[in-house]
């Protein structure tokens, strides 16, 4: 009886694993084996595919074959018993184009209200992604084990920290890789779960802000308790993108080591131009907090984020404030080509009760003022990128008297 050639050959490539699957054409014929040949582009001869010769099952692995993953190859298969079937040719393909990114490896560390996720490619020193290893980004899905409500986090790198979690709570997550340059989305990792720890006695510092004063940076933060010492560390932000490196060498800011106030001042020349991450830790001598959330600090934006200038037009029950570009020395306006948001603080001159308005517009109305009353106004600018979280210092306060009644029109 003539053997029929196998059909429906599928090539699955995940990372550096090359798997072939096919259907038997004739289930009734026993003791059939299958063999593959391959042919590279521009070659006439067929070569036996090692790992896929005389196979009794309908699956084989040819990962050991050292192929150029960017070069098109063609495969053919036949069935063998006493005689052989005709060859069945598989559509030619380029391994790199066909390849899927496998599930990444995930390593978790827990704090009381945070989880640190270390992600690395599932295949170490992969041939398939050798030229793209630096381009991997990851996304994850995380949920509380008890609720199952999922949150997605996109575009993260090989180390990511998730904050604002609940203590003593089990969180589960899965991660997948992507190569955006090649439009490839990977396969999710298995689900990993970890329980956050009991709440630490000392919370981490919060609301870290950097501003510029004279030739210095001023770093400020909030803290719950008094009589603490703090230390501040920095890291080049680009190191977060290094896929093979989970060992981050955070550096001390010398003027911010063991400070006893919730701020520290250090010269601008501590940092060269660039983007940095900053973090703060608190200690009371016996206990040490976990590190604060890391804030992004861009020296370029920081250096040029000057307080806004503004004019006030006074009415009886309101001020109209017109915000303009800040002036450099020499009275030339500074061009700030990133979106800003303005925080305007105003108060009655005879009172300490401040009120605040936050506006994206450069013309702002301050309503509900009393006639013939002196009010003071100060303003500062913030970048709208939450991660950068940059703020200028406040402008000098400007005080104006509202007009007498009935001039609000």
């Amino acid at each position: 009886k003539n053997l029929k050639s196998p059909q429906k050959v599928e090539v699955d490539i995940i990372d550096d694993n090359f798997i072939l699957r096919w259907n038997r054409s004739d289930e009734s014929v026993g003791n059939v084996t299958f063999s593959f040949d391959y042919q590279k582009t521009g070659m006439d001869n067929w070569i036996k595919l090692s790992g896929c010769q005389n196979i009794t099952s309908t699956k084989c692995n040819f990962s050991s074959l050292k192929l150029n993953v960017y070069e098109e190859i063609k495969l053919r298969i036949r069935a063998e018993k006493e005689n052989t079937s005709s060859w069945y040719e598989v559509d030619s393909f380029t391994p790199f184009r066909k390849a899927q990114i496998g599930p990444p490896e995930v390593h978790l560390e827990a704090e009381d209200k945070a989880i640190v996720i270390h992600i690395s490619p599932g295949t170490k020193d992969s041939v398939m992604w050798a030229l793209d290893g630096l381009s991997f980004t990851y996304s994850l899905v995380i949920w509380k084990n008890s609720s199952g409500v999922e949150e997605r986090i996109e575009n993260i790198y090989s180390r990511h920290k998730i904050y604002k979690l609940s203590p003593e709570t089990t969180y589960c997550l899965k991660v997948k890789a992507a190569l955006l340059t090649s439009w490839k989305i990977g396969v999710y990792s298995p689900v990993h779960c970890i329980k956050t720890t009991v709440e630490n006695e000392l919370p981490p510092p919060e609301n870290i802000e950097v501003s510029v004063q004279n030739q210095n940076y001023v770093l400020k933060w909030d803290y719950t308790y008094a009589n603490m010492t703090f230390q501040v560390q920095w890291l080049h932000a680009f190191l977060k993108r290094n896929p093979g490196n989970h060992l981050y060498k955070w550096k001390q800011i010398p003027d911010c080591e063991n400070v006893k106030t919730t701020q520290c001042v250090f010269p601008q020349n501590v940092f060269q131009k660039g983007i940095y991450l900053l973090r703060v830790q608190a200690s009371d001598g016996n206990n040490t907090s976990f590190w604060s959330e890391e804030i992004k600090f861009d020296t370029e934006i920081q250096a040029f984020l000057l307080p806004p200038v503004f004019n006030i037009r006074s009415l009886s029950d309101s001020f109209h404030i017109y915000i303009g570009a800040p002036k450099q020395s020499g009275n030339t306006p500074v061009i700030q080509d990133y979106p800003l948001i303005y925080e305007i603080i105003f108060w009655e001159n005879t009172s300490n009760a401040e009120r605040k308005i936050i506006e994206k517009k450069t013309d702002v109305t301050v309503p509900n003022l009393k006639p013939l009353t002196v009010y003071c106004v100060k303003a500062r600018a913030h970048t709208m990128d939450e991660k950068l979280n940059k703020s200028s210092v406040f402008s000098d306060a400007v005080c104006e008297k509202t007009k007498p009644g009935n001039t609000s029109k």
Partner: antibody
Framework: EVQLQQSGAEFVKPGASVKLSCTAS????????IHWVTQKTEQGLEWIGR????????KYAPKFQDKATITADSSSNTAYLQLSSLTSVDTAVYFC????????????WGQGTLVSVSA | DIVMTQSQKFMSTSVGDRVSVTCKAR??????VAWYQQKPGQSPKALIY???YRYNGVPDRFTGSGSGTDFTLTISNVQSEDLADYFC?????????FGGGTKLEIK
């Protein structure tokens, strides 16, 4: 293969100083922190401090701040521990170690150097 | 400094048994804890890091668990070659600190 090779045993008199070396192979010390840990006979392990050989930045346990000085020479891929004003209390084995791919723990250790202080 | 306390200085067990070595931190250290094995005259060897991750080549009879302040190294199906000192270590913050050690003796 990652290896840390430490210098040989030192027998010194009280008041003297000693400089121990730890030569790395299989990796570049500039890429990792190198730590020093001490252990007295039949006792536990104590962390002395660490160095970042890339820029020489050091951290010490308060107890060893005035006793130990850690340095590194990237060109010879070697870290050093200098111990000063030695007394019999400083008699111990001193280990160098290297962090893994995650900060803070030590998968790689040198074989240890015995420092014996005796009149 | 964060004190790490291994309350049992000695533990006696038999081949095939299961034994748990415990370690308590004076404050929460998250899961930033490692375990080491040290045999007489040798350097310490890493067994566990990040509380529960087994280091390469470590037999799966060694498992780590716990979080916050209480940590455990469990050796199931104890073998004669497991006779050694076992140390925990925190790396939540400097100065890094070790427990005093637990000597495992085989009956």
């Amino acid at each position: 293969e990652v290896q840390l090779q430490q210098s040989g045993a030192e027998f010194v008199k009280p008041g003297a100083s000693v400089k121990l070396s730890c030569t790395a192979s299989g990796f570049n010390i500039k890429d990792y922190y190198i730590h020093w840990v001490t252990q007295k006979t039949e006792q536990g392990l104590e962390w002395i401090g660490r160095i970042d050989p890339e820029d020489g930045e050091t951290k010490y346990a308060p107890k060893f701040q005035d006793k130990a000085t850690i340095t590194a020479d990237s060109s010879s891929n070697t870290a050093y521990l200098q111990l000063s004003s030695l007394t019999s209390v400083d008699t111990a084995v001193y280990f160098c170690s290297r962090e893994g791919s995650f900060t803070g723990w030590f998968p790689y250790w040198g074989q240890g150097t015995l420092v014996s202080v005796s009149a | 400094d964060i004190v790490m306390t291994q309350s049992q200085k000695f533990m006696s067990t038999s081949v095939g048994d299961r034994v748990s070595v415990t370690c308590k931190a004076r404050q929460s250290v998250g899961t930033y804890v490692a375990w080491y094995q040290q045999k007489p005259g040798q350097s310490p060897k890493a067994l566990i890091y990040s509380t529960s991750y087994r280091y390469n080549g470590v037999p799966d009879r060694f498992t780590g668990s716990g979080s916050g302040t209480d940590f455990t190294l469990t050796i199931s199906n104890v073998q004669s070659e497991d006779l050694a000192d076992y140390f925990c270590q925190q790396y939540h913050s400097y100065p890094y600190t070790f427990g005093g050690g637990t000597k495992l003796e085989i009956k």
